[in-house]
Interface confidence: medium
């Protein structure tokens, strides 16, 4: 996590810094929101858990052409510790649930700010 | 009970300045998106600009009227919102509310808006 | 910079049904809120979210969106409704709000 920030960052990011900016950018994508998101693409719900950010990555990842969320594509890749290709799937997606990218998207967000208010930021 | 004061509020000379407080209680400050809106006489309400929650990133937005020359903040550890007015024009004469805000209550976790004050009044004249 | 767009005056009998509407480019994406604002008085939020009312406000009061429309409909206007009635949106980027211009509703 001592390396996430992307490219405009001059050098590494404390994982508080990291979480926090994460937050900012889902919170930037559905402020105000009612359009649905990525036109209404569906995506495996996931098990908010550890090992999460990769399953989330995972689940996104296979949403393409919705710029709105390809910043938080890239900041997931810099939580998950191995490289996320679409198609690939772990034990955290619950397989047979799908919900909106939107839905997805609120239902990460909340979760982190539970996570940012106790401290976890691994 | 959920309650937002302003106060500050004043006679001030063009080109001068002037600084609003907003005391907020009854409700977790520091998960607040807040707003300020003003009002000028005999008109309609004008958004002024809105600070997020910390967590949010505290993300500040102003009106282009005032960009530059209004600045937004807060301090949560006194549950108290402000804001530094500068180069004060006499076109900022109005009463200006502060209220906690709707867009950002959906996503916090505390039940929001509609919460205003009753608003202070300032007058910009020489 | 981007605009709501509000008529400036509606006039009802009382019992009458007041429609009062709201138009801007970004509505189809963003949320729509209206306030009612009494003479002397803070606004105060009568629907949120396009079709939202929140607790303590009459079931008379409802709304509705439409592409670039949003309208507040008050079924059955009583003289206590008499107010000005604003819409408040955010612009595409949701980053920044705006009031459109204000309503005065005359129940009459």
């Known amino acids: 996590l001592t390396c996430l920030g992307g490219f405009a960052s001059p050098g590494p990011v404390p994982p508080s810094t990291a979480l926090r900016e994460l937050i900012e950018e889902l919170v930037n994508i559905t402020q105000n929101q009612k359009a649905p998101l990525c036109n209404g693409s569906m995506v495996w719900s996931i098990n908010l858990t550890a090992g999460m950010y990769c399953a989330a990555l995972e689940s996104l990842i296979n949403v393409s052409g919705c710029s709105a969320i390809e910043k938080t594509q890239r900041m997931l890749s810099g939580f998950c510790p191995h490289k996320v290709s679409a198609g690939q799937f772990s034990s955290l997606h619950v397989r047979d649930t799908k919900i909106e990218v939107a839905q997805f998207v609120k239902d990460l967000l909340l979760h982190l700010k539970k996570l940012f208010r106790e401290g976890q930021f691994n | 009970e959920v309650q937002l004061v302003e106060s500050g509020g004043g006679l001030v000379k063009p080109g001068g300045s002037l600084r609003l407080s907003c005391a907020a209680s009854?409700?977790?400050?520091?998960?607040?998106?807040m707003s300020w809106v003003r009002q000028a006489p005999g008109k309609g309400l004008e958004w002024v600009g809105r600070?997020?929650?910390?967590?949010?990133?505290?993300?500040?937005n102003y009106a282009a009227p005032v960009k530059g020359r209004f600045t937004i903040s807060r301090d949560d550890s006194k549950n108290t919102l402000y804001l530094q007015m500068n180069s004060l024009k006499t076109e900022d004469t109005a009463v200006y509310y502060c209220a906690t805000d709707q867009v950002g209550a959906y996503y916090g976790d505390y039940y929001g808006m509609d919460v205003w004050g009753q608003g202070t009044t300032v007058t910009v004249s020489s | 910079s981007y605009e709501l767009t509000q008529p400036p005056s509606v006039s009802v009998s009382p019992g009458q049904t007041a429609r009062i509407t709201c138009s801007g480019d970004?509505?189809?994406?963003?949320?729509a809120y209206w306030y009612q604002q009494k003479s002397g008085q803070a606004p105060v939020l009568v629907i949120y979210?396009?079709?939202k009312r929140p607790s303590g406000i009459p079931e008379r009061f409802s709304g509705s969106s439409s592409g670039t429309m949003a309208t507040l409909t008050i079924s059955g206007a009583q003289v206590e409704d008499e107010a000005d009635y604003y819409c408040?949106?955010?612009?595409?980027?949701?980053?920044?709000?705006?009031f459109g211009g204000g309503t005065k509703l005359t129940v009459l």
């Open positions: 009854g409700f977790t400050f520091s998960n607040a998106w």
């Open positions: 408040y949106s955010t612009d595409s980027s949701g980053n920044h709000g705006v």
């Open positions: 970004a509505l189809p994406e963003k949320y």
């Open positions: 600070i997020r929650s910390k967590i949010d990133g505290g993300t500040i």
């Open positions: 979210e396009d079709t």
